[in-house]
Amino acid sequence: MMTGTIETTGNISAEKGGSIILQCHLSSTTAQVTQVNWEQQDQLLAICNADLGWHISPSFKDRVAPGPGLGLTLQSLTVNDTGEYFCIYHTYPDGTYTGRIFLEVLESSVAEHGARFQIP
C-alpha cells in the first residue's frame, strides 16, 4: 500500500533572467527512493538515481543544475519556462509518486511590482 505523500513548493513565480529551485519532498513512507525524474510538460529535464547520480538532459545542461538534494535549479529563466514541472519519485517497494509544481516566469518589472503587494 502506498502511504507516502509528496510535498512540493506548489505554485511559484520568478523573474525572467533569474533562477529558481524546484523542490519536492516525499514523506510518510519508509520506502527507499531509487530514482527521481524531473519533467517539464513532456520533456525529461533531469534524473537523479541512487546508484548513478545525476543525469541532466543535454539540451538543458546550460540552464539546469542538480540540487540542492533531490531538487533542481533552473537558471537564466525565460518566459518560455512558464508551465508545469513534475517530480516523479520511483520508490521501493511502494512504486511511483508524482508531485506537481507550476512555475510562472514574469518580466522583471511585473515580478517586482507583484512583490510589493504580497501578503505576508
Epitope: 531509487t34 530514482q35 513532456d42 520533456q43 546508484d51 548513478l52 543525469h55
Partner: antibody, heavy 118, light 107 residues
C-alpha cells in the same frame, strides 16, 4: 571499455530448459538495471525481461511470464535468464543490454542464438 | 501495453538524402522514446535517447524530436554506413516495447 558477453544459447527441444548468462565488464555492474531483448529470425526486437539495480525488482513480457526468470549476481558481474518450458516461438537471438536510469539501453552484447526445435 | 507504430516499414534513399522516420505511441509517453540502429548480424546501437538527446559518439546528422505520442528520427544527409534498420522504443512503462522497424535501403 564496457563489454557484455552472452553465452548459453544452443539447440533445445520444445518443453526443455536453458540458462543464458551475460558477463559484464568495464563498469560498475551493480549500479545498472539490465535487460534481455530477443530477436526472432528476420523479425524485430522484443523486450523479454528487466531487473532493476537498487531494488532488484524484476519485470517480464507477457509472452514469457511464468516461464522465464531473470536474475543477477553482482559479485560475479553476471546477468542470467533461466528459460523453462521453451516453445518454438522462443527461437531467437537473445541480447543482454545495460539500462542506465531505466530510460535507455546504451550497451548491448553480441547476442546468443537459442533454437527450439525437435 | 503501449503499442509503438513506426512508419514507413521500409524506404529507399540515396546518399546525401534527408531521411525522416516517424514513430507513434498508443498513449502519451512524455519523452521516454529511444532510437536504435541495427545492421544485419549485429547488435542494436543506441542513437537517440529521451526523444532528442544524441548518444555519445553518434554523428550529429542524426537527430530526434517529438514528445507525447509523436516522434521523429531524422538523418540530415544519408551516408553509406547509415543503410540499416531503425527501431524506436518506449521506456515510459513496462513492458518496454519497440516499433516494428524501418529498413533504409539504397535506391
Amino acid at each position: 571499455e564496457v563489454q557484455l558477453l552472452e553465452s548459453g544459447g544452443g539447440l533445445v527441444q520444445p518443453g526443455g530448459s536453458l540458462r543464458l548468462s551475460c558477463a559484464a565488464s568495464g563498469f560498475t555492474f551493480s549500479s545498472y538495471s539490465m535487460n534481455w531483448v530477443r530477436q526472432a529470425p528476420g523479425k524485430g526486437l522484443e523486450w523479454v525481461a528487466g531487473i532493476k539495480s537498487s531494488s532488484g525488482n524484476k519485470y517480464y513480457a507477457d509472452s514469457v511470464k511464468g516461464r522465464f526468470t531473470i536474475s543477477r549476481d553482482n559479485s560475479k558481474n553476471t546477468l542470467y535468464l533461466q528459460m523453462n518450458s521453451l516453445r518454438a516461438e522462443d527461437t531467437a537471438v537473445y541480447y543482454c543490454a545495460r539500462g542506465p536510469y531505466d530510460v535507455w539501453m546504451d550497451y548491448w552484447g553480441q547476442g546468443t542464438l537459442v533454437t527450439v526445435s525437435s | 501495453d503501449i503499442q509503438m507504430t513506426q512508419s514507413p516499414s521500409s524506404l529507399s534513399a540515396s546518399v546525401g538524402d534527408r531521411v525522416t522516420i516517424t514513430c507513434r505511441a498508443s498513449q502519451s509517453i512524455s519523452s521516454y522514446l529511444n532510437w536504435y540502429q541495427q545492421k544485419p548480424g549485429k547488435a542494436p546501437k543506441l542513437l537517440i535517447y529521451a526523444a532528442s538527446s544524441l548518444q555519445s559518439g553518434v554523428p550529429s546528422r542524426f537527430s530526434g524530436s517529438g514528445s507525447g505520442t509523436d516522434f521523429t528520427l531524422t538523418i540530415s544527409s544519408l551516408q553509406p554506413e547509415d543503410f540499416a534498420t531503425y527501431y524506436c522504443q518506449q521506456s515510459y512503462s513496462t513492458p518496454l516495447t519497440f516499433g516494428g522497424g524501418t529498413k533504409v535501403e539504397i535506391k
